[in-house]
């Protein structure tokens, strides 16, 4: 046997190339055929009405054709002929490659609630071989589950990915990232996240700025309620007790002038959105006012709990009278 | 120049046989096949079968099948095509040509007649 | 089919032009191939191929193809022209297969 061949694979649309080559040439014809038997080249001549076939070298060692264009239907076995004693015959393989021919991702609802587990589906249409498809949330690589439904020598593929939602995920894209040998660099499709969950409330102290509350004082707390959708309604009260006469309220600030120990106890700020609804309490104690030696200084007293589990606590940093819990978030 | 000459003209009687020959000069004889195509008269052309001059393999139109061999001398750069159990409808101007996928040379023409 | 039909004759004044069609499923894959045929003599290759000529065919003669069906045409005609044109393609197995010819009168 002196004729060889190799085989091609090709990416739909591209061009790919037949070659037949002689080793020890006698001057017998050499011809190419298609999978269907039907002659392509005699010799340098082509009597098959396909121009998609062209000519790029043809010599006593080598009949070389072009095929520009490819489709699926051009795939498989192509022969090359030598007229020599006896007959051979060698075959190539064109394998064609088809890329997705489009990537859609769908998810089961626009927005979610936190905690509430979605569907997200990703469909990668008509190629060949079947598609690989990878999730991402943001950076991170997800499971998901696929199904390859075959038709006519095409592949569709589908994955499903499984999420239950956390508020972080508000605003991250969920990428479908495909994988397929007729595809260079990323193919990918992404949908961001759109997570509705209820207010985070958080009280800061924005005056005194150094934290300690004294008789005769001003205080004025901020609740910032943090939520999607944002709270539209943000109520201060006062637990267990009626709100002082001398407090104002201003959307959500808290002001009380001329502070007196009858101000004592714990002040709530509320919040809801359609998700729900959550708190943080201010725990108020009001100090002697100052004698003439001063005090040593305090800090403020942060605790951020999460159903009444306390996470953080920070207390004065010397232990005695004013070493006492001051905020807590629900 | 590319040349196919052939035998001369034959008279046969029904049912003997006639080799005609066909030489080639002026190309590599073993690097075309060689078909035999003839024509009666007043009539069209007809296929009849093909020999590779290298391997001495031959294919040969249904109609002709058991009747005719074609064969090949390649230390002459000859063919021959014979035809056996003559008829009265085998009288027809036998061509040789050879095969470049269309016929690019063509013989003479060989006439055969068959008459008692 | 494995057959290729053409119109048996067709006349064409002196320097005007004649249009030889050839019919065939094989057509649709192959291009035709066309001879040229004088009384008495071994048939001629005039066009082969999508619209190739031989050297030493005038460029008056040409070919097309379109579906199942092959044209030969002769554009101002000689009265040289005048023979039988056959046109020849190749069936599904690969053997050739003429047609049945058409005789070309110039007058």
């Known amino acids: 046997q002196n004729l060889f061949t190799k085989d091609v694979t090709v990416i739909e649309g591209e061009v790919a190339t037949i070659s037949c080559q002689v080793n020890k040439s006698d001057d017998s014809v050499i011809q190419l055929l298609n999978p269907n038997r039907q002659t392509i080249y005699f010799r340098d001549f082509r009597p098959l009405k396909d121009s998609r076939f062209q000519l790029l070298n043809f010599s006593s060692s080598e009949l070389k054709v072009s095929l520009t264009n490819v489709s699926i239907s051009d795939e498989g076995r192509y022969f090359c002929q030598l007229y020599t004693d006896p007959p051979q015959e060698s075959y190539t393989t064109i394998t064609v490659l088809v890329p997705p021919r489009n990537l859609m991702i769908d998810i089961q609802k626009d927005t979610a609630v936190e905690g509430e587990e979605i569907e997200v589906n990703c469909t990668a249409m008509a190629s060949k071989p079947a598609t690989t498809i990878r999730w991402f949330k943001g950076n991170t690589e997800l499971k998901g589950k696929s199904e390859v439904e075959e038709w006519s020598d095409m592949y569709t593929v589908t994955s499903q990915l499984m999420l239950k939602v956390h508020k972080e995920d508000d605003g991250v894209p969920v990428i479908c990232q495909v994988e397929h040998p007729a595809v260079t660099g990323n193919l990918q499709t992404q949908r961001y996240l759109e997570v509705q969950y209820k207010p985070q409330v958080h009280i800061q102290m924005t005056y005194p700025l150094q934290g300690l509350t004294r008789e005769g004082d001003a205080l004025e707390l901020t609740c910032e309620a943090i939520g999607k959708p944002q709270p539209v309604m943000v109520t201060w009260v006062r637990v267990d007790d009626e709100m002082p006469q001398h407090a104002v309220l201003s959307g959500p600030n808290l002001f009380i002038n001329n502070l007196n120990k009858t101000d004592n106890g714990t002040y709530r700020c509320e919040a809801s959105n359609i998700v729900g609804k959550a708190h943080s309490d201010y725990m108020l104690y009001v100090y002697d006012p100052p004698t003439t030696i001063p005090p040593p200084t305090t800090t403020t007293t942060t605790t951020t709990t999460t159903t009444t589990t306390i996470l953080t606590i920070i207390t004065d940093s010397r232990a005695g009278e004013e070493g006492s819990i001051r905020a807590v978030d629900h | 120049q590319v040349q196919l000459v052939q035998s001369g003209a034959e008279v046969k009687k029904p049912g003997a046989s006639v080799k005609v020959s066909c030489k080639a000069s002026?190309?590599?004889?073993?690097?075309?096949?060689m078909h035999w195509v003839r024509q009666a008269p007043g009539q069209g052309l007809e296929w009849m079968g093909w020999?590779?001059?290298?391997?001495?393999?031959?294919n040969y139109a249904q109609k002709f099948q058991g009747r005719v061999t074609m064969t090949r001398d390649t230390s002459i750069s000859t063919a021959y095509m014979e035809l056996s159990r003559l008829r009265s409808d085998d009288t027809a101007v036998y061509y040789c040509?050879?095969?470049?996928?269309?016929?690019?040379?063509w013989g003479q023409g060989t006439l055969v007649t068959v008459s008692r | 089919s494995s057959e290729l039909t053409q119109d048996p004759a067709v006349s064409v004044a002196l320097g005007q032009t004649v249009r030889i069609t050839c019919q065939g499923d094989?057509?649709?894959?192959?291009?035709a191939s066309w001879y040229q045929q004088k009384p008495g003599q071994a048939p001629v290759l005039v066009i082969y191929?999508?619209?190739n000529r031989p050297s030493g065919i005038p460029d008056r003669f040409s070919g097309s193809s379109s579906g199942s069906t092959a044209s030969l045409t002769i554009t101002g005609a000689q009265a040289e022209d005048e023979a039988d044109y056959y046109c020849?393609?190749?069936?599904?197995?690969?053997?050739?297969?003429f047609g049945t010819g058409t005789k070309v009168t110039v007058l």
């Open positions: 094989s057509l649709r894959t192959y291009y």
């Open positions: 020849d393609s190749r069936d599904s197995s690969g053997n050739h297969v």
């Open positions: 191929g999508k619209n």
């Open positions: 040509a050879r095969d470049n996928w269309n016929y690019d040379y």
């Open positions: 002026g190309y590599t004889f073993t690097g075309y096949y």
């Open positions: 020999i590779n001059p290298n391997s001495g393999g031959t």
